[in-house]
């Protein structure tokens, strides 16, 4: 499988936003690339979001997706928003070179995203 690199650990911001770079080593001259973020918890794998883009064009996720991203060459900058403490886990970047043939697939080792819910502000009496 194709080599895919991603950071081992990322800490989400206090607003529940986590960003990381997913980089792949392309064996060929792909024009259409699909990027999928998977979340693995124990033996369960769920798809968080996915986007297909044409090389040189912008990465477009569905309107209701919790992910946004930009692409530059063989590098994709991914941002996941709306995260809460319960979403802490391993997020895996999967890259597929869809067109032209041959089809290549690569799976990153995963980024452990830690999410800490902000402490609620104490009520103040004025």
């Amino acid at each position: 499988a194709m080599h895919v690199a991603q950071p081992a650990v990322v800490l989400a911001s206090s607003r529940g936003i986590a960003s990381f770079v997913c980089e792949y080593a392309s064996p060929g001259k792909a024009t259409e690339v699909r990027v999928t973020v998977l979340r693995q918890a124990d033996s369960q794998v769920t798809e968080v979001c996915a986007a297909t883009y044409m090389m040189g064009n912008e990465l477009t996720f569905l309107d209701d997706s919790i992910c946004t991203g930009t692409s530059s060459g063989n590098q994709v900058n991914l941002t996941i928003q709306g995260l809460r403490a319960m979403d802490t886990g391993l997020y895996i970047c999967k890259v597929e070179l869809m067109y032209p043939p041959p089809y290549y697939l690569g799976i990153g080792n995963g980024t452990q995203i830690y999410v800490i819910d902000p402490e609620p502000c104490p009520d103040s009496d004025f």
Partner: antibody, heavy 115, light 108 residues
Framework: EVQLVESGGGLVQPGRSLRLSCTAS????????MNWVRQAPGKGLEWVAQ??????????YYSDSVKGRFTISRDDSKSIVYLQMNSLKTEDTAVYYC??????WGQGTTVTVSS | DIQMTQSPSSLSASVGDRVTITCGAS??????LNWYQQKPGKSPKLLIY???NLADGMPSRFSGSGSGRDYTLTISSLQPEDVATYYC??????????FGGGTKVEIK
């Protein structure tokens, strides 16, 4: 039209050597990781070896059953992939297919190892 | 090594039937799975790649699904020309890129 044409098969005695060739056309050979897959008579498919391309430093991989005996190589200038098979055993008897990525398959060449 | 278990090993169904073949991996393979069709006396052909994508030139009655460890190939309406042996293959590193044992599909 994509074509992969294998050659070099035949009847060989155990312990001897054979070199298979696969000539590719109709696609960008240098973009492809090339594989050899074999199929023993009446049996299923078995992946044998893979050679990656220049961006992957022509890395090679082998199944445990052929490691140390078979060598895969490629010549991008001629769009050919080779499988050098040494110390052949009767259990290496099979149809050998060359594949480009796993998208394109040749018609196969038959190797029979028998005394 | 990751093992690929395919079932059934053979099946017989009527023309028009919905046919399902399963392939199970001994570990999570993240959709890194291909399906191949091999008609009698012919070379295998790529049928489904990346678990769900239909290869060029293959009829739309074929579909692939699954995730994690468990994958399925479905023929929505079996046709006489679908008589073949079907193989799954794990395409995730590290090697070996193991094939399932195959499923022989026949017409009743």
């Amino acid at each position: 039209e994509v074509q992969l044409v294998e050659s070099g098969g035949g009847l060989v005695q155990p312990g001897r050597s054979l070199r298979l060739s696969c000539t590719a056309s109709g696609f960008t050979f240098s973009d492809n990781w090339m594989n050899w897959v074999r199929q023993a008579p009446g049996k299923g498919l078995e992946w044998v070896a893979q050679i990656r391309n220049k961006p992957y430093n022509y890395e090679t991989y082998y199944s445990d059953s052929v490691k140390g005996r078979f060598t895969i190589s490629r010549d991008d200038s001629k769009s050919i992939v080779y499988l050098q098979m040494n110390s052949l055993k009767t259990e290496d008897t099979a149809v050998y297919y060359c594949t480009g990525g796993m998208d394109y398959w040749g018609q196969g060449t038959t190797v029979t190892v028998s005394s | 090594d990751i093992q690929m278990t395919q079932s059934p090993s053979s099946l017989s169904a009527s023309v028009g039937d919905r046919v399902t073949i399963t392939c199970g991996a001994s570990e999570i393979i993240y959709g890194a799975l291909n399906w191949y069709q091999q008609k009698p006396g012919k070379s295998p052909k790529l049928l489904i790649y990346g678990a769900t994508n239909l290869a060029d030139g293959m009829p739309s009655r074929f579909s692939g699904s699954g995730s994690g460890r468990d994958y399925t190939l479905t023929i929505s309406s079996l046709q006489p020309e679908d008589v073949a042996t079907y193989y799954c293959q794990k395409i995730l590193s590290p090697p070996p890129w193991t094939f399932g044992g195959g499923t022989k599909v026949e017409i009743k």
